[in-house]
Interface confidence: low
């Protein structure tokens, strides 16, 4: 089955610059299929723009200004690129690549889409580092005790643009865990978002990862925020111990090897 | 020019209650085209649901039913038993691929129909309320409540900033919510929730027993033990401090 990946979740440009959007095809040989590009402008219908066929023929939708879009493909990397020249406000949109995929049954085809790349045009000069800055919250003792479950919360702040994807995995697993998230919120010139994961007691002793995809992540790779295991065995204390919680008790944990 | 027009821009559906989306074709006979349905979820993922001639995307056949009403020039998509996973924008699109003619392989889309999923009507359930802290950051976690209407207050004398709460459907078909804020006096922040004309406090859920949960630090981590000599095992830390751990990446 054909699969399309658009590695850029977003692409931020200033006016009149050139944007290059990538689409990586897997499961199908790129030189044996046509790749289509669509755009969805805010509040408008998704519209076909341009395609490049298996033999390299390029077809543009009527009404699309010539010279605006350029499409090509690189068989060596199984990639199709949509180049948008001289970007302007009306180019703000989410751009999807797509291809027809044949089903097992003869004559049955479906069109599959990539996850999309949002083109953002800004006139702002932002700070050098506008990648998401994480803060982690670990389960409260009350929750683990009363509900035999624990909630991890991953807060991401001070990022730009607003396009971000967050998912959760256990440390040694590729399974994406069911999590919940708040809306992306504007804070001054940047954005914040949080996501939380509730796990049953039996999973609290496993390490969990909050995985964040953002255009401005360092080196363009997904940021992984490590949540350490929680030990939940109960230690009963002899009252004579005189070990009640002291208001001045502090815990300093230097977490190592957790940099993304 | 042909146009695909959804019946509604927004359709609220209840979990488990069948819902029908309709999309009419203007300017052409629907029978001259193949109809497709897609769902776009948070994060822009466009997933194929259905194409005429009984083609369904993976995982959609059991819970979705596509149909064409030739007489009314309508495409119909039924969601047989909606769940919270079905929230998203639904798009009808048409093509003539396989019907001959030139350049028939592009899709023409209609505008999306936003499907919002609400829990089924059910007995009222009081929330559980927990506070999580890290530095100046405080999160109030409100779990498993119904109905949705709720007010979450983080109680503090030294507020820096607060954010609107996120209210989402829980896997069990009730609601969960989180409210976040930053406070100079985060240690003393509590959370009170108004729900169903009652007030619930995070302090109602604080564990009164003298017991300890804890993080298991790796060997490379340093832990500073409380100064009291309590003869506890070496790497135990008070859970009261667990969610005040700072992490800078």
């Amino acid at each position: 089955a054909g699969h399309l990946e658009q590695p850029q979740i977003s692409s931020t440009k200033t006016l009149s610059k050139t944007a290059r959007l990538e689409c990586v095809v897997s499961g199908i040989t790129i030189s044996a299929t046509s790749v289509y590009w669509y755009r969805e402008r805010p509040g408008e219908v998704i519209q076909f723009l341009v395609s490049i066929s298996y033999d390299g023929t390029v077809r543009k939708e009527s009404g699309i200004p010539s010279g605006k879009f350029e499409v090509d493909r690189i068989p060596e990397t199984s990639t199709s690129t949509l180049t948008i020249h001289n970007v302007e406000k009306q180019d703000i949109a989410t751009y999807y690549c797509a291809l027809w995929e044949a089903q097992q049954e003869l004559g049955k085809k479906i069109k599959v889409f990539g996850p999309g790349t949002k083109l953002i045009i800004t006139d702002k000069q932002l700070d050098a580092d506008v990648s998401p800055k994480p803060t982690i919250f670990l389960p409260s003792i009350a929750e683990t005790k009363l509900q035999k479950a624990g909630t991890y919360l991953c807060l991401l702040e001070k990022f730009f643009p607003d396009v971000i994807k967050i998912h959760w995995q256990e440390k040694k697993s590729n399974t994406i865990l069911g999590s919940q998230e708040g809306n992306t919120m504007k804070t001054n010139d940047t954005y914040m978002k949080f996501s939380w994961l509730t796990v049953p007691e039996k999973s609290l002793d496993k390490e969990h990862r909050c995985i964040v995809r953002h255009e401005n992540n360092k080196n363009g790779v997904d940021q992984e925020i490590i949540f350490p295991p929680i030990k939940t065995d109960v230690i009963t204390m002899d009252p004579k111990d005189n070990c009640s919680k002291d208001a001045n008790d502090t815990l300093l944990l230097q977490l190592t090897n957790t940099s993304a | 020019a042909i146009e695909l027009v959804p019946e509604h821009q927004t359709v609220p559906v209840s979990i488990g209650v069948p819902a029908t989306l309709r999309c009419s074709m203007k300017g052409e006979a629907i029978g001259n085209y193949y109809i497709n349905w897609y769902r776009k979820t948070q994060g822009n993922t466009m997933t194929f649901i259905y194409r005429e001639k009984d083609i369904y995307g993976p995982g959609f056949k059991d819970n979705f039913q596509g149909d064409i009403d030739i007489a009314k020039n309508l495409a119909v998509l039924k969601i047989l038993a909606p769940s919270e996973r079905d929230e998203g924008s639904y798009y009808c699109a048409c093509d003539t691929l396989g019907m001959g003619g030139e350049y028939t392989d592009k899709l023409i889309f209609g505008k999306g129909t936003r499907v919002t999923v609400e829990p089924r009507s059910q007995p009222h359930t009081k929330p559980s309320v927990f506070v999580m802290k890290n530095g100046t950051n405080v999160a109030c976690l409100v779990k498993e409540f119904y109905p949705k209407d709720i007010r979450i207050n983080l109680v503090s004398s030294k507020k820096i900033t607060e954010f609107d709460p996120a209210i989402v459907i829980s896997p069990s078909g009730k609601y969960n919510a989180v409210k976040l804020g930053k406070y100079e006096d985060s240690n003393s922040v509590t959370c009170s929730v108004q729900h169903d004309n009652k007030t619930v406090h995070s302090t109602d859920f604080e564990v009164k027993t003298d017991s300890t949960d804890h993080v298991k630090p790796k060997e490379t981590e340093n832990t500073k033990q409380p100064s009291k000599s309590c003869h506890k095992p070496k790497a135990i830390v008070h859970t009261e401090k667990v969610n005040m751990m700072s992490l800078t990446v």
Partner: antibody, heavy 119, light 112 residues
Framework: EVQLVQSGAEVKKPGSSVKVSCKAS????????ISWVRQAPGQGLEWMGG????????NYAQKFQGRVTITADKSTSTAYMELSSLRSEDTAVYYC????????????WGQGTMVTVSS | DIVMTQTPLSSPVTLGQPASISCRSS???????????LSWLQQRPGQPPRLLVY???NRFSGVPDRFSGSGAGTDFTLKISRVEAEDVGIYYC?????????FGGGTKLEIK
């Protein structure tokens, strides 16, 4: 108790536009549909469209499509209805009304705003 | 659009007597979710409308129990068991099953 308070009466020339506001107080705003309904003198009620502020998505009656714009400002709990290319037959009282969603009854109504279109 | 037809146009009634207003829709108001989204509103002279009944027969909070709604499919009725002076005004039915929302033309209730 929830109240919807509308802006004052307007007198407009044909061809111009009018923008009527509707401010909600005393309850949640974002998760309710705010509909706009008009009533010409001595006539019945006519639904123009509505908005769900939390999603910022508006629905319009076909009759008004292209001429009406309904918006909402969540920060001030205010909904707006702008009607352009006014003609004399747009003279009416314009009401905003709140409902749990488009399907349920409109349970809270504004006091109405009289818009007179006259040359 | 769904056409909502109300009868009678005007209904003169004696105080303390019952009154009945009919509403017929041009097509079924049963939604795909199984509900019928028909409501009744009252508009007293010089006031905005007020919700009386939603989903055919559910009385809105604060509405006296002398008001009752009934019906199914395309035919609906609002009954007032004993008319009081404050009930004078125009009554509208409204459907919200199909887009766009549409109202009946109204029935004027007046005292004989």
């Amino acid at each position: 108790e929830v109240q919807l308070v509308q802006s004052g009466a307007e007198v407009k020339k044909p061809g111009s536009s009018v923008k009527v506001s509707c401010k909600a107080s005393g309850g949640t705003f974002s998760s309710y549909v705010i509909s706009w309904v008009r009533q010409a003198p001595g006539q019945g009620l006519e639904w123009m469209g509505g908005i769900l502020p939390i999603l910022s998505t508006a629905n319009y009656a076909q009759k008004f499509q292209g001429r009406v714009t309904i918006t909402a400002d969540k920060s001030t709990s205010t909904a707006y209805m702008e009607l352009s290319s006014l003609r004399s037959e747009d003279t009416a009282v314009y009401y905003c009304a709140r409902a749990h969603d488009y399907y349920y009854g409109m349970d809270v109504w504004g006091q109405g705003t009289m818009v007179t279109v006259s040359s | 659009d769904i056409v909502m037809t109300q009868t009678p146009l005007s209904s003169p009634v004696t105080l303390g007597q019952p009154a009945s207003i009919s509403c017929r829709s041009s097509q079924s108001l049963v939604h795909s979710d199984g509900n019928t989204y028909l409501s009744w509103l009252q508009q007293r002279p010089g006031q905005p409308p007020r919700l009386l009944v939603y989903k055919i027969s559910n009385r809105f909070s604060g509405v006296p129990d002398r008001f009752s709604g009934s019906g199914a499919g395309t035919d609906f009725t609002l009954k007032i068991s004993r008319v009081e002076a404050e009930d004078v005004g125009i009554y509208y039915c409204m459907q919200a099953t199909h887009h766009p929302l549409t109202f009946g033309g109204g029935t004027k209730l007046e005292i004989k």
